[in-house]
Structure formats: C-alpha cells, structure tokens
Interface confidence: medium
C-alpha cells in the first residue's frame, strides 16, 4: 500500500530513508539532455522474499538527440556506490536497515540519471530526521517517522524533534539533547478522528499505474 501522505514537516529539518521497504517505487528519471528509452522501465521496484530483497527493473537513459544508443547499469542490491550529488549526506546511519529483511538498499546510480531521486513510499517505511546546517537538535524521543495504516488510512507518526537556531552541528540521528516539547501534536495510536485534510485519498494506485498515472510517452 502506497503512503498517500507526506512525512511530517519539521521546521529547519530534513529527512531521509536509510533503506526502502518492499513495494517502494523509484522513478527512472534522466538528467537534462537525456530521456528514458521508449521500451525502458518507468520505475524500479523493491521486491523480494523473506531472505532477500532487490530492485526489479532497470532504469535506462539515452541521449535526447540519439535514438539508438542506450546507457544502462544493472542495479545490484549488494552494491553500495557513492552518489555524488548536492544532497546532504548523513554523518552516520542509525542502523544498517538495508540488512533487515524486506528492505532494499539505496540503488546504485545508473548512467545519466537525474540529480535527484523520486521515491514513492509504502506502509511501514521509516524516515529519519536531521536538523539542517546551523540548527541544533532538541528531542525527547526518536527523530524518525513511520508510515502506518490506521483505520484504513495511511499516516506518518510524529517525530519527537525540534531544531533550534544555535550554530552547532547536530549528530544524526540519536544524539541526546535537553528535553523540549516537540512541534506538532503527539501521535495517538487509538484516535480515529480523521479529517480529509489529514489524509487525502489518492487515485494514484499501483494497480492503475499504466492507465492513470503515466501519461504521454516521450517522442
């Protein structure tokens, strides 16, 4: 089940998945001047069994100017290549979540992929929060959020984190700081008071992917 909601917004914080639950989709996006080949995959999918998970499909990009040549890299789940992008890198990982059953590692890059990766999370996905540069983490609990299914709706739990504007580098994500009240409401596992603004029912479901989600083919 896709999470039809965004993880919570924490002021002056960003978040990251350390590993991806089976069912997660990663768009096959190409950098400027390149495009997906017509017969190529639209997305990669984290699949697997109880003992091993890996990314299905290959992302293939070809020059927009050429029609014949394709560049591709077959994703190897065991391979952990460094991605040289402008994205923030976490100083440490809380757990080697990629070694957990039912999770895929960050896929290695493919040739001419876009500079940013677009993921679509599923129920059970966990993301970890970190204060942006120049802000310090204050939290009384885990700086993480999990996508859960509650009463037929998906929701993300509220991370117990606030970021203060003190010029001090925060450790990520388990550094203990003085207690402070987190922004936002505490999560209630039993509450069923759900409004349409909390959870928007989306029509974009994996079952209708070919017909309703993906539109025109590149020429």
């Amino acid at each position: 089940e896709l999470c039809d909601d965004d993880p919570p917004e924490i002021p002056h914080a960003t978040f990251k998945a350390m590993a991806y639950k089976e069912g997660t989709m990663l768009n096959c996006e190409c950098k400027r001047g390149f495009r997906r080949i017509k017969s190529g995959s639209l997305y990669m999918l984290c699949t697997g069994n109880s003992s091993h998970s890996s990314w299905d499909n290959q992302c293939q990009c070809t020059s927009s100017a050429t029609r014949n040549t394709t560049k591709q890299v077959t994703p190897q789940p065991e391979e952990q290549k460094e991605r040289k992008t402008t994205e923030m890198q976490s100083p440490m990982q809380p757990v080697d979540q990629a070694s957990l059953p039912g999770h895929c590692r960050e896929p290695p890059p493919w040739e001419n992929e876009a500079t940013e990766r677009i993921y679509h999370f599923v129920v059970g996905q966990m993301v970890y929060y970190q204060c942006v540069q120049g802000y310090r983490a204050l939290h009384r609990g885990p700086a993480e959020s999990v996508c859960k299914m509650t009463h037929g709706k998906t929701r993300w739990t509220q991370p117990q984190l606030i970021c203060t504007g003190e010029m001090e580098t925060s450790q990520f994500p388990g550094e203990e700081k003085p207690q402070a009240s987190p922004e936002g409401r505490p999560e209630s596992e039993t509450s069923c008071l759900v409004t349409t603004t909390d959870f928007q029912i989306q029509t974009e479901m994996a079952a209708t992917m070919e017909t309703s989600i993906f539109t025109t083919e590149y020429q």
């Epitope: 990251k16 876009a114 940013e116 677009i118 539109t215």
Partner: nanobody
Framework: QVQLVESGGGSVQAGGSLRLSCAAS?????????MAWFRQAPGKERDFVGS????????SYADSVKDRFTISRDNAKSTVYLQMNNTKPEDTAVYYC??????????????????????WGQGTQVTVSS
C-alpha cells in the same frame, strides 16, 4: 520531466476573485512533484506566492497573500490551482507555476525559494484594476 501550462489569468477589479490553473504533463508520476506559484511584476524580481507538497498535506504562503490566496492540487487531474480572493492592484503580475522533484535523500516537504524549482511554466498575466 514535467511540462507546465498555466491558464485562468485575466483582468479583475480590486476585491474580486480569480482562479488560476496549472496543468502538468509528462511521462511520470504527478505526485512526484511539489508545486508552487510565483509572480513577477514589471521591473521586479520573481517572487514566491505559495507552495504545496506533493499530496497537498503542506502549504506555505508569502505574507502578502496569506488569508487571501489558497493553493490546492488535484493529483487525479495533474493540476495545481491558485484561488485569488480579495485581490489588490499590487497583485498585478505574470503568475508562474513551478515544480520541483522530491529527492531520495534529505528534503523538505515545502520549498519557497525559486532556485529550488527545476520546472517552470510560461506564465499567465493577472491584472487587478482599482
């Protein structure tokens, strides 16, 4: 990649309402994109108006339009809207729709800086007369 086309611009009297639309197309998931509206008055910088996260969970507005403008989106129609109420002459500008991709690494759900948006529409003119 996504292509953006704005519509709904035109002339309106001060205090009136206008609804702008921005239709997205491209071979991708529309919910991959955070969306925003910017505006540019003659001889001025392109300024942030409002933004909305990929599922509509989060919105952010410029102080000058708070409580007057509302941004929303319909992922089934691949469209983002800007409802402009109680318009003022200073709202006169070319309004641009913009999109940014969600990254697999650290990201924030709502972005407000124009440099953070990779995709732009051609713009639609809004004129508010007093």
């Amino acid at each position: 990649q996504v292509q953006l086309v704005e519509s709904g611009g035109g002339s309106v009297q001060a205090g009136g309402s206008l609804r702008l639309s921005c239709a997205a197309s491209g071979r991708t998931l529309y919910s991959s994109y955070g969306m925003a509206w910017f505006r540019q008055a003659p001889g001025k910088e392109r300024d942030f108006v409002g933004s909305i996260s990929r599922y509509g969970t989060y919105t952010s507005y410029a102080d000058s339009v708070k409580d007057r403008f509302t941004i929303s989106r319909d992922n089934a129609k691949s469209t983002v809207y800007l409802q402009m109420n109680n318009t003022k002459p200073e709202d006169t500008a070319v309004y641009y729709c913009a999109a940014y991709t969600y990254s697999g690494s650290f990201y924030s759900a709502v972005k407000t800086h124009r440099d953070e948006y990779q995709y732009w529409g051609q713009g639609t003119q809004v004129t508010v007369s007093s």
